[in-house]
């Protein structure tokens, strides 16, 4: 039986070109994590093993950082990179825990002062 | 290479109490949960349970709950079996056997095997 | 907790001949589904793991198949170095048990 619950940071925002971290924390459950993947929608875009350690999907390695911990940095935010993320934790002997994340990135303050105070 | 190497064969009067060893090398110990699979005289596999490396935790199938002990001592990479006020029926090979961790877990390494037997 | 039903419990075939064992499951493991073989006197080794991956270093006459919450280990041409049991495992909850075994002998 699964006992365990994921933790997640919610529903969470930050500017555009700015960075976020996204994390998960797994509790109530002796289960062994033995591997997480990160992904957005049906992309992935870093898993964690425990004994090979990082590997960040090609696709994604000039935006995506390792950690903290089994979290994961996403640097040079886009209003694309909006949506939902999921968090995989692989657990012995439990199988699979899943965690969700919203996250809106919003027009910077500063690029909506540029936008509206252009020199013609 | 990965290898499990357990200890010697035991022999045991009833109400005694036995501690096999199970010593890992080739790779990182905390890394890979470790399991214990008994084998009776003439009789099938059956697992014990196992410990989280990561943690220390144990967790104990149905008929092992009573007098039988999961251990680590990561110093010297070594899992350990305790079994106590030991009985003629717990007379078996007892296996040390490491989880890959692959996403679709399987018993990839086992130990030699501990034959303990319990006579009086 | 969730059952395994392993048939045949033993089997005598010739040497060339295909071997078929199946496990069954009482509810859905989705692959989570191992085999392992046992030479006497030694400690098992894997043979197929997640229903129908062939572990590194097993021959390929080794296979196995899904079907719902049955499971098949198939020897498509039994060799002498068979002689064994074979024994699957659930490994996609607590407790990761094993079916009852079978033992293939050489006629």
């Known amino acids: 039986m699964m006992t365990g619950t994921i933790e997640t940071t919610g529903n969470i925002s930050a500017e555009k070109g700015g960075s976020i971290i996204l994390q998960c924390h797994l509790s109530s459950t002796t289960a062994q994590v033995t591997q997480v993947n990160w992904e957005q929608q049906d992309q992935l875009l870093a898993i964690c093993n425990a004994d090979l350690g990082w590997h960040i999907s090609p696709s994604f390695k000039d935006r995506v950082a390792p950690g903290p911990g089994l979290g994961l940095t996403l640097q040079s935010l886009t209003v694309n990179d909006t949506g939902e993320y999921f968090c995989i934790y692989h657990t012995y002997p439990d199988g699979t825990y899943t965690g969700r994340i919203f996250l809106e990135v919003l027009e910077s303050s500063v690029a909506e002062h540029g936008a509206r105070f252009q020199i013609p | 290479q990965v290898q499990l190497v357990q200890s010697g064969s035991e022999l045991k009067k009833p109400g005694a109490s036995v501690k096999v060893s199970c010593k890992a090398s080739?790779?990182?110990?905390?890394?890979?949960?470790m399991n214990w699979v008994r084998q009776a005289p003439g009789r099938g596999l059956e697992w014990m349970g196992w410990?989280?490396?990561?943690?220390?935790?144990?967790a104990y199938a149905q008929d092992f709950t009573e007098r039988f002990v999961f251990s680590l001592d990561t110093s010297v990479t070594t899992a350990y079996l305790q079994i106590s006020s030991l009985k003629a029926e717990d007379t078996a090979v007892y296996y040390c056997?490491?989880?890959?961790?692959?996403?679709?877990?399987?018993?990839?390494?086992w130990g030699q095997g501990t034959l303990v037997t319990v006579s009086s | 907790d969730i059952q395994l039903t392993q048939s045949p419990s033993f089997l005598s075939a010739s040497v060339g001949d295909r071997v078929t064992i199946t496990c069954r499951a009482s509810q859905g493991i989705s692959s989570y589904l191992a085999w392992y073989q046992q030479k006497p006197g030694k400690a098992p080794r894997v043979l197929i793991y997640?229903?129908?991956t062939l572990q590194s270093g097993v021959p390929s006459r080794f296979s196995g198949s899904e079907s719902g919450t049955e499971f098949t280990l198939t020897i498509s041409s039994l060799q002498p170095e068979d002689l064994a049991t074979y024994y699957c495992q659930k490994l996609n909850s607590h407790p990761c048990s094993f079916g009852q075994g079978t033992k293939v002998e050489i006629k």
């Open positions: 997640g229903a129908t």
């Open positions: 080739g790779y990182t110990l905390t890394n890979y949960p």
């Open positions: 410990i989280n490396t990561n943690t220390g935790s144990p």
């Open positions: 056997a490491r989880t890959a961790i692959t996403s679709v877990y399987h018993f990839d390494y």
